[in-house]
């Protein structure tokens, strides 16, 4: 069975109303520009076959992909929210840098790969969708990692 290592975030990360609000505002701005409402990136399929104790590691992978492959290319858009939310998410990513699981992470990698492929396939609209789901990313990190 997978064993988690340091897959933990302090609850205080999620107790700052200002940055919570900015994250939600950024997600809302992007979701208004997203007209592909049938596709959900952070939803039932992402968590399928992954036990709750391994979901922080799963969300770490999604967070890192979102930062590197989505927020970086779109960093000029959705200001001023983007310039405030990216450092916050980077801080969470750094706090999870030692989060690993030893054991079978096949389901996790498969689910993350599916998410990445969906974003890539949709191109820029996939990136917009991922930004529009930052509220879900935020809540999922809180649920899984605290």
């Amino acid at each position: 069975l997978p064993v988690n290592t340091r897959c933990k975030l302090e609850v205080s990360n999620f107790q700052q109303p200002y940055i919570v609000n900015r994250t939600f505002m950024l997600a809302k701005e992007a979701s208004l520009a997203d007209n592909n409402t049938d596709v959900r990136l952070i939803g039932e399929k992402l968590f399928r076959g992954v036990s709750a104790k391994d979901q922080c590691y799963l969300m770490k992978q999604v967070l890192n992909f979102t930062l590197e492959d989505v927020l970086l290319p779109q960093s000029d858009r959705f200001q001023p929210y983007m310039q405030e939310v990216v450092p916050f998410l980077t801080k969470l990513s750094n706090q999870l840098s030692s989060c690993h699981i030893s054991g079978d992470d096949q389901n996790i990698q498969k689910n993350v790969r599916r998410l990445k492929e969906t974003v890539k396939k949709l191109g820029e609209s996939g990136e917009i969708k991922a930004i529009g789901e930052l509220d879900l990313l935020f809540m999922s990190l809180r649920n899984a990692c605290v």
Partner: antibody, heavy 121, light 111 residues
Framework: EVQLVESGGGVVRPGGSLRLSCAAS????????MNWVRQAPGKGLEWVSG????????DYAASVKGRFTISRDNAKNSLYLQMNSLRAEDTALYHC??????????????WGRGTLVTVSS | QAALTQPASVSGSPGQSITISCTGA?????????VSWYQQHPGKAPKLIIY???KRPSGVSNRFSGSKSGNTASLTISGLQAEDEADYYC??????????FGGGTKLTVLG
Amino acid sequence: EVQLVESGGGVVRPGGSLRLSCAASGFTFDDYGMNWVRQAPGKGLEWVSGVNWNGGTRDYAASVKGRFTISRDNAKNSLYLQMNSLRAEDTALYHCARGWYSGAAWNMGYWGRGTLVTVSS
Amino acid sequence: QAALTQPASVSGSPGQSITISCTGASGDVGAYNFVSWYQQHPGKAPKLIIYDVNKRPSGVSNRFSGSKSGNTASLTISGLQAEDEADYYCSSYTSTFSVVFGGGTKLTVLG
């Protein structure tokens, strides 16, 4: 088959306390966030409290914050709601509810039948 | 936190389509990524019929569909049937880590 069975309701005086329990079966309990939702007689649904899979986050409606405490015992497949300083407006049927899928407790896909709490002098 | 706003009642004849709206301030529902809809028959526990805005749980009829636009989420029931007569509630998870419900809509199937 997913089953949620609430217990612990009853009649209590204003200012009194009750502890509700929810016994879960038919699924891996510690893979899911859980909630308490209440419904006053003839009224709508009101979310009371929620807890994530490991008890690390516990959230409350403003109307019960400071008076109610949610907890879970994963070894016993049980969810609890400790209710203190009860008021007449807390009178309701209290449901235990599980997230539809692991990772999103706010989609309440499975519900117990509820346990009735009556606060009356 | 104020409840989301739903019409108190809607009605329709068998075979018709009806739509129930659910409106909230942007602070309540963010981008509406968290919207769920529940059906409740008298004396029964609520039943999840839409989650994640527009997804249907297995076993729920495809006559039920969900959507969002701006600050309003909607539930549409097509091909109305007598057994659809019930109370319907929308809900959303919020940026304050709470769940808010709408006040509920009583659906009457005429005839």
